[in-house]
Amino acid sequence: IVLRPSRVHNSEENTMRALTLKDILNGTFSYKTFFPNWISGQEYLHQSADNNIVLYNIETGQSYTILSNRTMKSVNASNYGLSPDRQFVYLESDYSKLWRYSYTATYYIYDLSNGEFVRGNELPRPIQYLCWSPVGSKLAYVYQNNIYLKQRPGDPPFQITFNGRENKIFNGIPDWVYEEEMLATKYALWWSPNGKFLAYAEFNDTDIPVIAYSYYGDEQYPRTINIPYPKAGAKNPVVRIFIIDTTYPAYVGPQEVPVPAMIASSDYYFSWLTWVTDERVCLQWLKRVQNVSVLSICDFREDWQTWDCPKTQEHIEESRTGWAGGFFVSTPVFSYDAISYYKIFSDKDGYKHIHYIKDTVENAIQITSGKWEAINIFRVTQDSLFYSSNEFEEYPGRRNIYRISIGSYPPSKKCVTCHLRKERCQYYTASFSDYAKYYALVCYGPGIPISTLHDGRTDQEIKILEENKELENALKNIQLPKEEIKKLEVDEITLWYKMILPPQFDRSKKYPLLIQVYGGPCSQSVRSVFAVNWISYLASKEGMVIALVDGRGTAFQGDKLLYAVYRKLGVYEVEDQITAVRKFIEMGFIDEKRIAIWGWSYGGYVSSLALASGTGLFKCGIAVAPVSSWEYYASVYTERFMGLPTKDDNLEHYKNSTVMARAEYFRNVDYLLIHGTADDNVHFQNSAQIAKALVNAQVDFQAMWYSDQNHGLSGLSTNHLYTHMTHFLKQCFSLSD
């Protein structure tokens, strides 16, 4: 007879279970959001669960299917785009990922008026980018690095550019570095508001050094992937901006937009383009040394048929304490007079705030102020400005949506979201219809995410678009960890942290601690968002305490914290993680013999440096796809924060801040180094050099590579990765399997 302890039926805790690694890897507790695809002030499209494309009219309450799942399925479409005149839909299939944003696909045009696919003059394949004009049904697309224009979907295409060449000249699409580090888009072409003009960028990568790596595949010989990739200090792409009249494109030809003289005098970047009207365009430029940005407003002179960018319409933004902007230089949001605009930049106290610029930046009127930051301007109407900030209750990791009445004087401010679902929702984004007639709010947490529809005049909630009921029900019998967001005050620095605690956390006991770090400039890890992920599992099932700390260099708490790391990456980010760990030990519930740190990408760099700090604090740690030397990373990103790796600039710190320089210090820690061999972003070279330095120093370590995987380590590699890291941590913390 085997005696088992009897189950206590009435205790709710005993009917609940901890999270499993399988739950995480299967995405069992993933959530849904609802972003309307707005097509007018009161209408939006949405892809239903059964894949029909449905048009919803908020005012009539009616909805109808504009495109059936049968039509979608007939070409295996995974995406769609309705032309503004509602006559055609493009259907996207054969999606093939390239880099972070870019992909190629096959496109079919469906004629809604006759219910047939457009035959004749079909689009070539695969296409790199395709979009409708903002009015009517003109099409612009990029094929083999050249831009084409169709006046109507069934028309033959007009070729706008002819010099496009793989890895050499990119028209209408960015090269690798512009895609990843500057534009953060797959496209580099922009229609004017009524579709009269098409602006596009040309990137010339002819002189850029190439990163080459093996892609092993299944063939007898691996193939070599070649990417023009400027590392710190290397030759950069040469960019030019052109505008073409799309009504009669064959006549005048593409017209080059002049670069401001103060920018053109040395290496520079183009950072963004914003159309104001059909005859006014705003371009933003940035010096290679990224502390000077110029916003240039250009006008089309009909009589001269030229784009004129007068010096009087050049607005300079300069940082004396760091780099220009936050992660990127902010983009302007123009007001109805089509010349003045709203823009986020640092105020005199070093906090990013909304400013109104009418004539010069010097005379800018500050719209928001305080020891918090405005984060995004969503929409400007004739009487309101909608923006997000982290002002409410002084939590930097929150996001609420505010409305400022700009039609009245003095302008009044209202928080639209602060008190809607206060416990559940503290981190919002928004999506606005034309003229902000209606908007959707998407709440990301800290509770279960919820998406709602609101009236743009009254802010009244109209309906719930998605409330994740299934997820809520599924989580009812799960023992989720407890989360708390608090701050540490250390030497006049505020360190916000998020602590994830085991469900039955007891302050009088000792727990192993895992620090999860990213720590990159202008990042934020401590956010009031919902997540059921790997670290939730580690706390729930394995009884670990996990902490995330936002140290110096992180965002949305003012320039003092943000720019502290300027020109010295790898110093204060690491120091602040270490400081926080010491404070956590002082709290009394951390087993100081069982402390680990892990991070990915920039976080892998920080975790590696923390492990090699010689403090003796960490027993073990993991670096996934780490940067190991800033000389190996992309110019645009690296130089923004580090300057140039030249003797007369910042070469010394480039050399001092490598992981390899600290190889000896890994001797007394358990180190797991992980990297994908086909990482186009943080090249495998980084980990190869760490490994070489450790071998040369005769330091033992563990490593795992993922063949043919990129920076994301996706698919089956994800499962393998988290399983492998779990084993490593459990072994480090002496937890039974």
């Epitope: 004749g120 003059n121 006046q151 028309d155 033959p156 295409p157 007009f158 070729q159 550019t161 002819f162 010099n163 040309e202 030019r240 052109f242 009504t247 009669y248 064959a250 006549y251 005048v252 030809g253 593409p254 017209q255 080059e256 001269w304 048929q305 030229t306």
Partner: antibody, heavy 117, light 108 residues
Framework: EVQLLESGGGLVQPGGSLRLSCAAS????????MSWVRQAPGKGLEWVSA????????YYADSVKGRFTISRDNSKNTLYLQMNSLRAEDTAVYYC??????????WGQGTLVTVSS | EIVLTQSPGTLSLSPGERATLSCRAS???????LAWYQQKPGQAPRLLIN???RRATGIPDRFSGSGSGTDFTLTISRLEPEDFAVYYC?????????FGQGTKVEIK
């Protein structure tokens, strides 16, 4: 008033070189793409080459690619066509025209190029 | 390249008559990219119908362009003595831009 004035034509031996010029006035020269179009004696019109307003991109007919070079000096309001390795079949009246690929709304009076030994 | 075939080669008409000139493209062009020119002996060509079937500046309204796809027509509603010349159609949708071989309109 828009005016285009070609010069530089003449008699040249096969294999020789010639540089044509087109002086422009009466419009914002740097804003417009410009083209060269030729017409062999008693024959039709043939597009030869084009250049966009900034001079950043150039285009050529297959028949002249690698031998002819189009360029412009916007400070002098002048368009050029450098013709090398000339052949008998290049004999024609060469017109400069305002426009890129079509809608050539202004033409010069033309300059005759004769390639003969 | 796109081949433009003009017909007829020669059109013999009297002043005051209507002239209809045809231009057929080897592949679809659309009117946005088709132009018509007039050339008189010893002179440079002159733009008549701009891309998009628009009359060029200073061109009398007796000249009109029409058509789409591959078939285009230049119509001169009432021939004036100064209209007797060679007429060329030209496409600009595809590189290289090409001209038709011309239609000569002569006095009957």
């Amino acid at each position: 008033e828009v005016q285009l004035l070609e010069s530089g034509g003449g008699l040249v031996q096969p294999g020789g070189s010639l540089r044509l010029s087109c002086a422009a006035s009466g419009f914002t020269f740097s804003s417009y793409a410009m083209s060269w179009v030729r017409q062999a004696p008693g024959k039709g019109l043939e597009w030869v080459s084009a250049i966009i307003g900034s001079g950043a991109s150039t285009y050529y007919a297959d028949s002249v690619k690698g031998r002819f070079t189009i360029s412009r000096d916007n400070s002098k309001n002048t368009l050029y066509l450098q013709m090398n390795s000339l052949r008998a079949e290049d004999t024609a009246v060469y017109y400069c025209a305002k426009g890129w690929f079509g809608g050539f709304n202004y033409w010069g009076q033309g300059t005759l190029v004769t390639v003969s030994s | 390249e796109i081949v433009l075939t003009q017909s007829p080669g020669t059109l013999s008409l009297s002043p005051g008559e209507r002239a209809t000139l045809s231009c057929r493209a080897s592949q679809s062009v659309t009117s946005s990219y088709l132009a018509w020119y007039q050339q008189k002996p010893g002179q440079a060509p002159r733009l008549l119908i701009n891309v998009g079937s628009r009359r060029a500046t200073g061109i009398p309204d007796r000249f009109s362009g029409s058509g789409s796809g591959t078939d285009f027509t230049l119509t001169i509603s009432r021939l004036e003595p100064e209209d007797f010349a060679v007429y060329y159609c030209q496409q600009g949708i595809m590189l290289p831009p090409t001209f038709g071989q011309g239609t000569k309109v002569e006095i009957k």
